[in-house]
């Protein structure tokens, strides 16, 4: 007889990413004997929860919990039964719930209580449902990207761990209700709230991070709509030939549109608004989202927020990727430089509704928002964060790395399950030939 080598035992972890517009479930797996290696945890499977985000269940909290059932049932099938009890399960909510918590804390608590009730019905090791801070969302996204790209440590041929020469990658996340920028910096932050010190695999990282609430793609679109209603009888970012009827209550119910909300308005009034395909007026409308008038620090990004100069390469994911991918793939436009990105945005904004529909057959109303989305991404990167042509050359637009979705979820799980040691692993296990 001879020994049969069994495949290494796998461990699993589950994270529910409760975003503002929808919830996604990610199941991760890793070999139990290699927990401290970098880049060893990968995505096993995923599931998109049908319907809206959990914050949309403010008036029906139990519905928030119920909405997760389909994906949780999938998790029961995707994770081997004997691993259920040892599989940590987390739910993290982001800016949609941060907004709900600002406007209706009781509803926010009720929604979290309802999802907790549902999650505890499953045989996994449930470890809590909570709202992440913007800082956590940014940092965990940065950790995810650099972990997957193996930027923290490398395994040497001599069996020792060593720090690679390549630096870390900055991370830019454009969600539905907020956007985050996070990157390693050498100089101490002038604003302590935007600095995070991390110790990973024995290395020290000083990281700048900031989250801009109400600067997620969906909230930006809503704010632009509110501005268009306020200043124009048309929407310059919508295509000519696109007309919609807007219920004023829908536009002004978000805390992000408070600034544009009229003193008195009839929330049940329906207003007709048409697009005008005007890239220049659209650019002006988008520019109005950013304030550069005052900066209490030596330098700022926008709205008086401290930011050191962008340094190194960046990965831009989520709606950054989807917006740029639409320009590249659906519209066939080059976006390799900032100048090309601006030209692509202008190109989309010049299209009429009929031209857009002919150019991207099959899709429907979602097409109307790509002009504003592209213009916002271009403005945010160039004027907001201060990327020049050289720095922009180091930005990659990508939604996955190593077959795993880039976002805060993996970094969150790695942190909470202690899968990234603060100190470097010791010598490689094995036979000593000396």
């Amino acid at each position: 007889t001879r020994d049969i080598r069994e495949p290494p035992a796998l461990k699993y972890g589950i994270v529910l990413d409760a975003g503002s517009s929808h919830t996604s479930m990610f199941i991760y797996k890793w070999p139990a004997d290699k927990e401290n290696d970098t880049g060893i945890v990968g995505q096993h499977s995923s599931c998109d929860v049908p319907g809206g985000g959990i914050s949309s269940y403010a008036d029906n909290p139990s519905g928030a919990g119920q909405s997760l059932v389909g994906c949780l049932e999938q998790a029961l099938r995707d994770v081997p039964k004997e691993r259920h009890a040892g599989t940590p399960l987390y739910l993290g909510a982001t800016a949609g719930m941060r907004l709900l918590n600002l406007t209706n804390p009781e509803a926010s608590t009720s929604v979290l209580t309802a999802v907790t009730h549902t999650l505890t019905q499953y045989p996994f090791d449930f470890r809590g449902a909570r709202i992440l801070s913007g800082q956590e969302e940014g940092v965990f996204g940065w950790v995810t990207a650099n972990y997957l790209l193996e930027n923290f440590i490398k395994y040497g041929w001599v069996g020792r761990w060593f720090r690679p020469r390549k630096g870390t990658l900055g991370a830019m996340d454009l969600g539905g209700a907020s956007t985050q920028i996070t990157f390693e910096t050498t100089s101490p932050a002038e604003d302590r709230a935007s600095e995070v010190q991390l110790r990973l695999y024995g290395q020290h990282y000083r990281v700048y991070t900031h989250s801009f609430l109400c600067y997620g793609r969906d909230q930006v679109l809503q704010r632009l709509l509110a501005s268009a209603l306020q200043t124009h009888s048309f929407h310059p970012c919508w295509p000519r030939g696109f007309s919609t009827h807007v219920l004023l209550g829908d536009v002004y119910q978000s805390p992000c549109t408070v600034a544009q909300r009229p003193q008195t308005f009839n929330s049940s009034a329906r207003v007709s608004l048409s697009g005008s395909s005007d890239p220049h007026l659209c650019r002006d409308l988008v520019s109005g989202l950013f304030s550069f008038s005052s900066c209490p620090f030596s330098r700022c990004s926008f709205n008086g927020v401290f930011q050191p100069p962008v340094a190194g390469n960046f990965i831009a994911f989520s709606a950054f990727f989807y917006t740029v991918n639409f320009l590249r793939t659906s519209m066939g436009l080059p976006v390799a430089t900032l100048q090309q990105l601006e030209a692509a945005a202008v190109n989309v904004c010049n299209q009429t509704w009929a031209q857009l529909q002919a150019r991207v057959p099959g899709q429907q109303a979602h097409l109307a928002d790509y002009c504003a989305g592209a213009m916002f991404v271009q403005q945010l990167l160039s004027r907001g964060y201060g990327f020049d042509e050289r720095a922009f050359g180091g930005v990659i637009f990508q939604k996955k790395a190593a077959d795993t979705a880039v976002g805060w979820a993996l970094g969150y799980m790695l942190n909470l399950t202690n899968l990234i040691p603060a100190d470097p692993p010791g010598l490689r296990k094995g036979t000593d030939f000396s």
Epitope: S20, S21, H22, P50, G51, G52, G53, S55, S56, G96, L99, G176, A177, D218, Q219, L221, Q222, L225, R240, G241, F242, S243, T244, H245, V246, L247, D250, V251, Q253, S254, S272, S274, T352, W353, A354, Q357, P361, G362, Q363, Q364, A365, H366, A368
Partner: antibody, heavy 129, light 111 residues
């Protein structure tokens, strides 16, 4: 209140062109809305044919695209359907309808839902020799 | 194009009872958390009338006994307590993808 009324011949010979007109009252067809034609085969469901927009843009169902023309006469506040090379399979009740994109908010995300909320009473067209 | 299949083809319900009509899409009619599904009611000899948009939003003027639910590919129109005047044919319609398409219809008969 917007009202729509279809008119046109009830009998068309095979291979000929079916022509229908929809007269809109209570609203200018150039002010907004998408002006649709929809048909319903006997005992069957509804089939969207296409529209002409307030801005005079057309959008047609790909299955009928090479036979359909939707045009408008703004002076009469009317829009028309022409369907060429008809066969017995084009026998149906033809409706005109006003549609638009309704902005709706869900989960902090706005979106646009295409709805057809004003309809004519329908006119029956039979294709037969 | 997206094909919508309704069931049952005919539904017979007594006044006061609950009526449930199903609509299944050949592909998801959701996009970024929104369901692009509408429901229409057509009474004999009349034009269709919009009841529900975006899967679950009641059109103004429509009685609260009508409700819609579902997402992705599976949608339901429910009449909580059927009234005699609800006798009609009900159609689902998707607007996620061009061209807009309708289901084959469900005829609701009142016993």
């Amino acid at each position: 209140q917007i009202q729509l009324q279809e008119s046109g011949p009830g009998l068309v010979k095979p291979s000929q062109t079916l022509s229908l007109t929809c007269t809109v009252s209570g609203y200018s067809i150039t002010s907004g809305y998408y002006w649709n034609w929809i048909r319903q085969h006997p005992g069957k469901g509804l089939e969207w044919i296409g529209y002409i927009s307030y801005d005079a843009d057309n959008n047609y169902n790909p299955s009928l695209k090479n036979r359909v023309t939707i045009s408008r006469d703004t002076s009469k506040n009317q829009f028309s359907l022409k369907l060429s090379s008809v066969t017995a399979a084009d026998t149906a009740v033809y409706y005109c309808a006003g549609g638009y994109y309704r902005y709706g908010l869900g989960s902090y995300r706005g979106s646009y839902y295409y709805v057809m909320d004003y309809w004519g009473q329908g006119t029956t067209v039979t294709v037969s020799s | 194009e997206t094909v919508l299949t309704q069931s049952p083809a005919t539904l017979s319900v007594s006044p006061g009872e609950r009526a449930t009509i199903s609509c299944k899409a050949s592909q998801s009619v959701d996009y970024e958390g929104h369901s692009y599904m509408n429901w229409y009611q057509q009474k004999p000899g009349q034009a269709p009338r919009l009841l529900i948009y975006a899967a679950s939003n009641l059109e103004s003027g429509i009685p609260a006994r009508f409700s819609g639910s579902g997402s992705g590919t599976d949608f339901t129109l429910t009449i909580s307590s059927v009234e005699p005047e609800d006798a009609a044919t009900y159609y689902c319609q998707q607007s996620n993808e061009d061209p807009p398409t309708f289901g084959g219809g469900t005829k609701l008969e009142i016993k």
